[in-house]
């Protein structure tokens, strides 16, 4: 009888079984019993990840620097174009379409995690202790000057977006 | 034991016909693609038609295209090739082939076409 | 059509010797070949097939080798029997081609 099924790497046509194409080529023809498979290789700038019965092959991505896009690894006749984001930039999803700027971690809080092409910027509130004044992708929670240690008093107490004063100690009259 | 026998050959015009016959047995002959080879006295071996299994394509070189047919009647195990137009560089023995994993396992003994005036 | 060119065609050699013909495709067919031996008078035997699985039947001193466009059939030590003409066959593109085949003859 016919195959009604098919081994890995066929596919079924005309109740007959046909090697599908490898990765970085498309198909051509179709199997007979007296030929096999006709595949071809992609072009330039193309690309197939499976194997296939394709006719034809897809477009390499392009990573459009007009949204902030760059190649972060080029495409090959077996995989696409990989887009990362400039300097400053992160993706906005997982497949990297477009890119946005790196968010700033407000005064009052400091950067946990420094963003990467793919990642924004994490943020955490300064605790006690601890204070940020200025608003920056990069900047930690910076710890409150010790007073004790310069042979200052606290004369103002800190918070989470200043520092504390420090001055001199009463002298006893 | 698989058995392939040719018959139908022999001297014909040029623009004449002739129908070959290729009788299987020994083996389930409907499950098997089938073709015809042919060998010209003290040539190489051209590959000259095939049928598929359960009634499948045909398929024919580009230099009888046109002219030949290939046929097969399961019910009588047997492959045919229907030869139209026939010219003088058809001569040649042509052997009916079992295919098997896009080889040709089996043979037949062949038969001789002749075309001459 | 794919064309199939076999190498050399006509070859002289002596019982025990280690022969290689080789065949050239016209352009890639992967490992889509076989190798069939012709003895005068008969039909066609196939001893290899897929360019290097031995035919079941065939002496173990038939080898296949090759993929692409490049094959060779190597006799590794030559029998009375083996005395033939050799044909390659390539069935990666419609139609089937076969080469001119190679002359094995006794030196």
């Known amino acids: 009888e016919p195959p009604t099924a098919c081994r890995e790497k066929q596919y079924l046509i005309n109740s007959q079984c046909c090697s599908l194409c490898q990765p970085g080529q498309k198909l051509v023809s179709d199997c007979t019993e007296f030929t096999e498979t006709e595949c071809l290789p992609c072009g330039e700038s193309e690309f197939l990840d499976t194997w296939n019965r394709e006719t034809h092959c897809h477009q390499h991505r392009h990573c459009e620097p007009n949204q902030g896009l760059r190649v972060k690894k080029e495409g090959t006749a077996e995989s696409d174009t990989v887009c990362t984001c400039e300097e400053g930039w992160h993706c906005t999803s997982e497949a990297c379409e477009s890119c946005v700027l790196h968010r700033s971690c407000s005064p009052g809080f400091g950067v946990k995690q420094i963003a990467t092409g793919v990642s924004d910027t994490i943020c955490e509130p300064c605790p006690v202790g601890f204070f940020s004044n200025v608003s920056s992708a990069f900047e930690k929670c910076h710890p409150w000057t010790s007073c004790e240690t310069k042979d200052l008093v606290v004369q103002q107490a800190g918070t989470n977006k200043t520092d504390v004063v420090c001055g001199p100690q009463d002298r006893l009259r | 034991e698989v058995q392939l026998l040719e018959s139908g050959g022999g001297l014909v015009q040029p623009g004449g016909s002739l129908r070959l016959s290729c009788a299987a047995s020994?083996?389930?002959?409907?499950?098997?693609?089938m073709s015809w080879v042919r060998q010209a006295p003290g040539k190489g071996l051209e590959w000259v038609s095939g049928i598929g299994s359960y009634g499948g394509g045909t398929y024919y070189a580009d230099s009888v295209k046109g002219r030949f047919t290939i046929s097969r009647d399961n019910s009588k195990n047997t492959l045919y090739l229907q030869m139209n137009s026939l010219r003088a560089e058809d001569t040649a023995v042509y052997y009916c082939?079992?295919?098997?994993?896009?080889?040709?396992?089996?043979w037949g003994q062949g038969t001789l076409v002749t075309v001459s005036s | 059509d794919i064309q199939m060119t076999q190498s050399p065609s006509s070859l002289s050699a002596s019982v025990g010797d280690r022969v290689t013909i080789t065949c050239r495709a016209s352009q890639s067919i992967s490992s889509y070949l076989n190798w069939y031996q012709q003895k005068p008078g008969k039909a066609p035997k196939l001893l290899i097939y897929?360019?290097?699985s031995l035919q079941s039947g065939v002496p173990s001193r038939f080898s296949g080798s090759g993929s692409g466009t490049d094959f060779t059939l190597t006799i590794s030590s030559l029998q009375p029997e083996d005395f033939a003409t050799y044909y390659c066959?390539?069935?990666?593109?419609?139609?089937?081609?076969f080469g001119q085949g190679t002359k094995l003859e006794i030196k």
């Open positions: 020994g083996f389930t002959f409907s499950s098997y693609a």
């Open positions: 897929a360019a290097s």
């Open positions: 082939a079992r295919y098997v994993n896009f080889g040709m396992d089996y």
């Open positions: 066959q390539q069935y990666g593109r419609n139609p089937p081609t």
